[in-house]
């Protein structure tokens, strides 16, 4: 009886769209790497669905993912990081869909942190600095950062600056005086690894000073 139910489940499952996407995070917890996968369709019924990765692993043939609500997750030291792995969605031991992926091409860096902005009165500029955990990593060390800033009242008018360092200077003359600005930063692998933008850092807010008239100037 249960056999018939399982076959029925399988037939139903084969009609669904099980497209999924994954990203890796290297050395995310000491020397441990992580791999996170999720279905593209948020309405997929994930009951009884499992994810498994096989190939390009150290000491083991395959690894099963843990399910955390609607995402599937592995944290391990066992990724070889050379060659392609096969990632499959399975139900009752049968693969529904699979993807061959090199984990070094789907890297999502950790979000930058400690973003701050310091105004230099003498230089009439703002020095933007932030930190990234990737400076200490063995693998994904080279990143491109995207610094985005906007005047708080301009909801969708973000200005973007791409840079490889963790320091940026914004000239006061290019910003509105006496205005509140929001600034944030994210990172993407830039060399040796490929992948996706990190999450945005927490936003930092700063106010530009009023324009001081020089002595002797008329109002």
């Amino acid at each position: 009886e249960s056999g018939y139910a399982q076959n029925g489940d399988l037939e139903d499952a084969e009609l669904d769209d099980y497209s999924f996407s994954c990203y890796s995070q290297l050395e995310v917890n000491g020397s441990q790497h992580s791999l996170t996968c999720a279905f593209e369709d948020p309405d997929v019924n994930t009951t009884n669905l499992e994810f498994e990765i096989c190939g390009a692993l150290v000491e083991v043939k395959c690894l099963s993912f843990r399910k955390l609500q609607e995402i599937y997750f592995i944290e391990t030291k066992k990724f070889l990081l050379i060659g392609k792995s096969n990632i499959c969605v399975k139900v009752g031991g049968k693969s529904l869909t699979c993807k061959k992926i090199d984990l070094t091409t789907i890297v999502k860096p950790e979000a930058p942190f400690d973003l701050s902005v310091i105004y230099r009165e003498g230089a009439n500029d703002f020095v933007v600095t932030f930190n990234t955990s990737h400076l200490q990593k063995k693998y994904v060390k080279v990143l491109m950062h995207d610094v985005a800033y906007r005047q708080e009242k301009d909801e969708n008018k973000w200005m973007h600056v791409n840079l490889s360092s963790t320091k940026l200077t914004l000239l006061q003359r290019n910003l509105q005086p006496e205005a509140m600005y929001e600034i944030k930063v994210r990172s993407i692998p830039d060399h040796y690894f490929k992948g996706f933008w990190s999450e945005w850092s927490p936003s930092y807010y700063f106010r530009t000073p009023e324009i001081n008239n020089s002595p002797g100037e008329m109002d």
Epitope: C54, G55, A56, G83, K84, S85, T105, Y192, F193
Partner: nanobody, 118 residues
Framework: DVQLVESGGGLVQAGGSLRLSCESS????????MGWFRQAPGKELEFLAA????????HYSDSVKGRFTISRDNAKNTVYLQMNSLRAEDTGRYYC???????????WGQGTQVTVSS
């Protein structure tokens, strides 16, 4: 039709060095993992070293770690194996392989002979 061609083998004295090259004509070279293997007379094929598509990640067998270095030049479609402090037991035919796909190397060269005399 030949897709992987090894070169650089030869006769060398113990303690000496050799640099093997493997040129690929496979269109996906710059996104493929590459590996080096050897087969000593009367022995099984032995994995030596592998390198990821960009060169950032390498992996070595314990038998060659610290003596051999794998590298690649994606502009030249070539992978190298620098072999230092060679020993008599390093004698064998050296093969390169391309595209490590779910634990199977998809393409293999014909090999180049390395002989280390003591």
């Amino acid at each position: 039709d030949v897709q992987l061609v090894e070169s650089g083998g030869g006769l060398v004295q113990a303690g000496g060095s050799l640099r093997l090259s493997c040129e690929s004509s496979i269109s996906t070279f710059s996104s493929d993992a590459m590996g080096w293997f050897r087969q000593a007379p009367g022995k099984e094929l032995e994995f030596l070293a592998a390198i990821g598509w960009s060169g950032a990640v390498t992996h070595y067998s314990d038998s060659v770690k610290g003596r051999f270095t794998i590298s690649r030049d994606n502009a030249k479609n070539t992978v190298y194996l620098q072999m230092n402090s060679l020993r008599a037991e390093d004698t064998g035919r050296y093969y390169c392989a391309e595209d490590y796909d779910t634990d199977v190397w998809q393409y293999w060269g014909q090999g180049t002979q390395v002989t280390v005399s003591s």
